[in-house]
Amino acid sequence: FERTRSLQDPCSNCPAGTFCDNNRNQICSPCPPNSFSSAGGQRTCDICRQCKGVFRTRKECSSTSNAECDCTPGFHCLGAGCSMCEQDCKQGQELTKKGCKDCCFGTFNDQKRGICRPWTNCSLDGKSVLVNGTKERDVVCGPSPADLSPGASSVTPPAPAREPGHSPQ
């Protein structure tokens, strides 16, 4: 049935970039300026997206494809097809309702977007802090305190007594 209908429907012959004009005996007419049709057989053309204000044009609209927008410097895209532009912050900051705020102590953000995240807790992996964290950078974990040097055992609790010949795990 679908195939039969498409043979009888003159609109199915209208290619992308045109529309089937009912006012002109279903002739395929080109999309008017600032509009497009990305598929064939369309009865109308869609209005081109306008990249206004904080949005800038990444790709111009053509008769067969919509315009694509991105954000002006200082902002980044959010959402499908860059439906929103969100303010950038500096590294070491996060965006709040009241603008960019520095990361609290113990947290960091190494990007211009997103939220401040807690520093890695090296001790959870049995490691020590090799390089302290900052607002912009996470801590760097090093080897476990016991592996650092022979003298390091003084800062770690004594290991339980073991049979001779057994090394610590």
């Epitope: 204000g53 860059c82 439906s83």
Partner: nanobody, 121 residues
Framework: QVQLQESGGGLVQPGGSLRLSCAAS????????IGWFRQAPGKEREWVSC????????YYADSVKGRFTVSRDNAKNTVYLQMTNLKPEDTAVYLC??????????????WGQGTQVTVSS
């Protein structure tokens, strides 16, 4: 008809002042933040300033801090950008937009067409 309209642009000498207006019609400006942007010939569009709807707190680009002041008169449905100590590098088309929030703009926000500011001796 819902629209934003900028006015107040013109030619001014370096060191001079101008006050731009961003007037809304067809909607209540008091519900929206207002952001100001500018675009100089051959340059990227640049964020200038924004004023929040809730508490009228204002934010400024480093390049205009201390020289530009943004304010709002919700009764007149208008936001103002007072520009002082103008420099030739302030020459641009200035436009305003009405997001819900200074930090986030949507593709369906209202925008004006812009007003030309030229700073030259």
């Amino acid at each position: 008809q819902v629209q934003l309209q900028e006015s107040g642009g013109g030619l001014v000498q370096p060191g001079g002042s101008l006050r731009l207006s961003c007037a809304a019609s067809g909607f209540s400006l008091g519900l929206y933040a207002i952001g100001w942007f500018r675009q100089a010939p051959g340059k990227e569009r640049e964020w200038v300033s924004c004023i929040m709807s809730s508490d009228s707190s204002a934010y400024y680009a480093d390049s205009v801090k201390g020289r530009f002041t943004v304010s709002r008169d919700n009764a007149k449905n208008t936001v103002y950008l007072q520009m002082t100590n103008l420099k030739p590098e302030d020459t641009a088309v200035y436009l305003c937009g009405a997001p819900r929030d200074c930090s986030r703009y949507s593709s369906d926000d209202y925008w004006g067409q812009g007003t030309q500011v030229t700073v030259s001796s």
